[in-house]
Amino acid sequence: SETTTGTSSNSSQSTSNSGLAPNPTNATTKAAG
């Protein structure tokens, strides 16, 4: 059985956080000054 938690965001488990970074495919690598 799955447990529910009281998180700081007070969100229920029915609303999933993907946990994923943006990882945009169009990001370009640029050396910092």
């Epitope: 993907s18 943006p22 990001a27």
Partner: antibody, heavy 117, light 113 residues
């Protein structure tokens, strides 16, 4: 309260496979977030190893990809790390952590793994 | 991979001092879709796991004292501790949570002067 706890052998021989498990309490690993492994060699910085998402999909650090497998046991609310062909360079404290869309918000306490014959 | 460079690598300071740690990324961490910077700060004490301090460059995590603040955008970021407390002596890491593989800075060790 979300808690993560690493477990596994503290000593692994060179060329063997390192196997660790992270047990999660207070949240179901199938309900959301990514569940990552991160390591820290003695006296050094942090290195992200990879994750298994709540969907079951995985992503690994290319620097380790050929040696890493992350899997899960949903019945036990656990996820695991296997790192093959280890060398002394794999000696580190290994952490499991929960990944949000912006950070690692919950971490295990870490487990030390030494690679030595 | 995005390279994260922190400076200084170590810093000696006294209780009550104002301290600033800098972090530079080799690529902009500003996501055009939501205008957020995906830069995170952690605090680590010896023998302990890192603790989340700040996400999105400037958003303090729950329970983090207001003396900790983050700023910056694009490639240049800072973590400021306005008035050092004894419990703040630790190592601080920045991390980019923007593009995989996720990467961390080398750390800044904050020591008592």
């Amino acid at each position: 309260q979300v808690q993560l706890q690493e477990s596994g052998p503290g000593l692994v021989k060179p060329s063997q496979t390192l196997s660790l498990t992270c047990t999660v309490t207070g949240y179901s690993i199938t309900s959301g977030y990514t569940w990552s492994w991160i390591r820290q060699p003695p006296g050094k910085g942090l290195e992200w190893i990879g994750y298994i998402q709540y969907t079951g999909s995985t992503r690994y650090n290319p620097s380790l990809k050929s040696r890493v497998t992350i899997s899960r046991d949903t019945s036990k609310n656990q996820f695991s790390l296997k790192l093959s062909s280890v060398t002394a360079a794999d000696t580190a404290v290994y952490y499991c952590a929960r990944g949000t869309t912006a950070s690692f918000d919950y971490w295990g306490q870490g487990t030390t793994v030494t690679v030595s014959s | 991979d995005i390279q994260m460079t922190q400076s200084p690598s170590s810093l000696s300071a006294s209780v009550g001092d104002r301290v600033t740690i800098t972090c530079r990324s080799s690529q902009s961490l500003l996501y055009s879709s939501d205008q957020k910077n995906y830069l995170t700060w952690y605090q680590q004490k010896p023998g302990k796991a890192p603790k989340l301090l700040i996400s999105w460059a400037s958003t303090r995590a729950s329970g983090v004292p207001s003396r900790f603040s983050g700023s910056g955008s694009g490639t240049d970021f800072t973590l400021t501790i306005s008035s050092l407390q004894p419990e703040d002596f630790a190592t601080y890491y920045c991390q980019q949570y923007f593009i995989y593989p996720l990467t961390f800075g080398g750390g800044t060790k904050l020591e008592i002067k």
